[in-house]
């Protein structure tokens, strides 16, 4: 969470951003809020990116003003126009690219004053893992697959029964480059699995951490997965 202030007493407004991550090829959100103003026609929102000459996006007088927009963002940005009046200046970024990573500034002008705050935006690829029993293997084996990751993540196996155990000797992880030559498919295999146990496949890079759980009993198999973005701390 980053909170910025405008300059000089009465003419400052609070602007707040949250560091976030974008999943390449998908749509992302750059989050920014500000002290709301009831005079919509006076509100100006400017998104800028460090190292980029043109604007990322501009919203003024109730609508987008894209004449100064940088080419790399053409057709890919939008604010939530219906939410501007209540202080939401967040930017939707379509089809996130690896090169969209960097430092962004959310700059706000209202009838009450000015303010800005920076936002660190990371880009990469992350996806939910799925853990299955590999019936083709000679021994009891689990297979953890996640279709899209970048940068290359680490994969760690854990088990509920053998807490703290190191499974690196009984697991094998491979990374297969996807067709767009950036993201990779993650496949990790765990051998010598015992029943009546819950196993977790944890995939992590500097952007996201995802976990796929599988509980194997004699009568059933239960799965669960979740993904968490690793936002950078406030600065």
């Amino acid at each position: 969470l980053i909170i910025g202030f405008g300059i000089s007493g009465r003419h400052s407004i609070t602007v707040t951003t949250v560091a976030s991550a974008g999943n390449i090829g998908e749509d992302g959100i750059l989050s920014c809020t500000f002290e709301p103003d009831i005079k919509l026609s006076d509100i100006v929102i400017q998104w800028l990116k460090e190292g980029v000459l043109g604007l990322v996006h501009e919203f003024k007088e109730g609508k987008d003003e894209l004449s100064e927009q940088d080419e790399m963002f053409r057709g890919r940005t939008a604010v939530f126009a219906d939410q501007v009046i209540v202080g939401n200046a967040s930017l939707r970024l379509k089809n996130v690219q690896l090169t969209d990573a960097g430092t962004y500034k959310c700059y706000i002008i209202t009838s009450k004053g000015k303010g800005n705050a920076n936002l660190e935006y990371k880009t990469g690829a992350f996806s939910m893992p799925e853990v299955n029993v590999d019936y083709n293997a000679s021994s009891e084996t689990l297979r953890c697959e996640a279709p899209r990751w970048f940068p290359q993540p680490t994969v760690v196996w854990a088990s509920q029964v053998d807490q703290g155990a190191n499974f690196s000797e009984v697991s094998n992880t491979s990374f297969e480059l996807n067709s767009e030559n950036v993201t990779m498919k993650v496949v990790s295999v765990l051998y010598n699995v015992t029943i009546n146990n819950t196993y977790s496949c944890m995939i992590e890079n500097d952007i996201a951490k995802a976990t796929g759980d599988i509980k194997v009993t004699e009568s059933e198999i239960k799965r669960r997965s979740h993904l968490q973005l690793l936002n950078s701390k406030a600065s």
Partner: antibody, heavy 117, light 107 residues
Framework: QVQLVQSGAEVKKPGASVKVSCKVS????????MHWVRQAPGQGLEWMGA????????EYAQKFQGRVTLTADTSTSTAYMELSSLRSEDTATYYC??????????WGQGTTVTVSS | DIQMTQSPSSLSASVGDRVTITCQAT??????LNWYQQKPGKPPKFLIY???QLAEGVPSRFSGSGSGTDYTLTISSLQSEDFATYYC?????????FGGGTKVEIK
Amino acid sequence: QVQLVQSGAEVKKPGASVKVSCKVSGYPFTSYWMHWVRQAPGQGLEWMGAIYPGKSDTEYAQKFQGRVTLTADTSTSTAYMELSSLRSEDTATYYCTSTWTHYFDYWGQGTTVTVSS
Amino acid sequence: DIQMTQSPSSLSASVGDRVTITCQATQDIVKSLNWYQQKPGKPPKFLIYYTAQLAEGVPSRFSGSGSGTDYTLTISSLQSEDFATYYCLQFYEFPPTFGGGTKVEIK
């Protein structure tokens, strides 16, 4: 859920003042504008003014400038509207209404003010 | 101030009818328009925001459209609970201003 609860009906004499309260629950009171709108019997809606409780910023309709005062008590999440120098044409129902998710998204139940000698 | 002219000021309709109410602004309000429904003795109810977005819990028979200076509220098939007065509100230019209202009565 969001609730805006207003004070009860008032009967006032011409020249007097009235103070109407609006207690808010269910959203962060200090961070969003609170507006006041009135409606004379059988008439339409008329915006009077607004307050931003977090900074006590106020905006007033020109028509009411100098006669209406908006205040807020952030400790109790209550907004107040005081109208002075009352005249018979101020007889109306007074509403507080929030701009939390959108403009005028939640409304108080209304407070009837009758000005009569 | 921006003036909002709402028409008609009243209309009579039957259950099942398609009803259209219009609001015209004296200048471009860039879709910054909401619609409200009010029944006697009750506060206005938030219906449609930013020209065309339905507020939470509002039936899909209600719809909004428009741009520039001209805006429309449509009730595709009038129900008995829809008999009420409807107001538009522009919040683009300060101060916010309401239309004069349209009373929808039973024919």
